[in-house]
Interface confidence: low
Amino acid sequence: SERCDDWGLDTMRQIQVFEDEPARIKCPLFEHFLKFNYSTAHSAGLTLIWYWTRQDRDLEEPINFRLPENRISKEKDVLWFRPTLLNDTGNYTCMLRNTTYCSKVAFPLEVVQKDSCFNSPMKLPVHKLYIEYGIQRITCPNVDGYFPSSVKPTITWYMGCYKIQNFNNVIPEGMNLSFLIALISNNGNYTCVVTYPENGRTFHLTRTLTVKVVGSPKNAVPPVIHSPNDHVVYEKEPGEELLIPCTVYFSFLMDSRNEVWWTIDGKKPDDITIDVTINESISHSRTEDETRTQILSIKKVTSEDLKRSYVCHARSAKGEVAKAAKVKQKVPAPRYTVELACGFGAT
């Protein structure tokens, strides 16, 4: 067959859908690879072709679009299942082609079973709510395009296994779920079930997401360096190991990049010749405040090293701070014979 630009298997798009529910899957060519829309391709005389490889098979086969009740159909660049079956699991390929051009990409589709409490192998998106921050909402995700705006679906919300009714601080409002004051106790999995009619049939869409309550921006502060500090002096003799921890507290900040680094005499450790190793550990509080520790280690410190300036730096979206460690050479204890002898005036 003629050459085709093959983007391979796009495992970044591990699509998971629930069994016995509608699913609409856009050809990833237009979203991630070719960067122009189906209409442009279509008006340029290109045709979109779909085929698939069943789970545990190697044979590529066409998709049967002539199933009863149009169970699988294609509309523009979307492949529709109304509804899915477990054995729809496999690798799906969309191919865009005409007589002179061909481009294709494959992606895995997994049809997943859920239990009565909505537990499943589905990877869940995480939605972060700020602790004690006033009213915040989550929205039932990925339901656009399933029904026209003229159709009014019914939406039921659950926390874990339990229908959300008469909860103290959580109120269902159609597609939204409002948290009056988010607390740690609101952490958990929330599910919306959207029910809508289509051509005399009733379909359900189940969407579960994880809510994680995190530190509020109202309480956020610039990074706080706990160590090094003014109370600890790192006194070493040449030849000893120098270990200086830099311990920094970062308030949780959405999408903030927390950074900790050391400089030695104003340079990054990588840019100097001394043999330095840096080990980092990270821990989180329940509200995702972060404590980072970077331990600077020089195995056999020299007297030159003990004269250097060691500064710990930290940066987040709230600001940048720095703190120098107090490093000095240990003064050797007096050697009795020599120093006492000098004291008695011996020559």
Partner: antibody, heavy 119, light 108 residues
Amino acid sequence: QVQLLQSGAEVKKPGSSVKVSCKASGGTFSIYAIDWVRQAPGQGLEWMGGIIPIFGTANSAQKFQGRVTITADKSTSTAYMELSSLRSEDTAVYYCARNGATSDAFDMWGQGTMVTVSS
Amino acid sequence: EIVLTQSPGTLSLSPGERATLSCRASLSVSSNYLAWFQQRPGQAPRLLIYGVSRRATGIPDRFSGSGSGTDFTLTISRLEPEDFAVYYCQQYGSSPLTFGGGTKVEIK
């Protein structure tokens, strides 16, 4: 930052042809459509046609079919529009425009090339 | 082909006023593929709005788009001196791509 740089102004005789170039710099060229739009003096915008360089196939408005040739050279990231059998009413500014990185609309335009057709 | 009709042809307003520009399509615009462009004298057009209502990168929020099907509107909430220009709507959902005739927003 992506830029579209067009060739300079042209003065042509009726019946001749003109070829305008549009070079893309600073970004991916072949995966976006490059379209051509013209604007006669004091008039509105008129779509002529476009090409998706990775496809190599162009499409054009029926009005220009048979007279316009749109091509692209992926190696130089340059698109070309050639209009033949020129007449005085083809006097216009010719723009190239990129059909969408974030959208499918013309999100990036060249500076325009003035083509004057005069005997 | 889809014919786009813009109205009014000219809009005379003062800085600080609200401008409402209309674009009507002869057929329904596929998948809401409708854009608005601004063109100042001697310059290339600049994308303001795409997908009916989505602002392009760097466009101030005083510009907003709305509508569906065949009727679309561009609104400039408070005209700034640099907003006096010609505005074009364009549908890019079906070939041939077409532009409206333009609305000139001039200083009163």
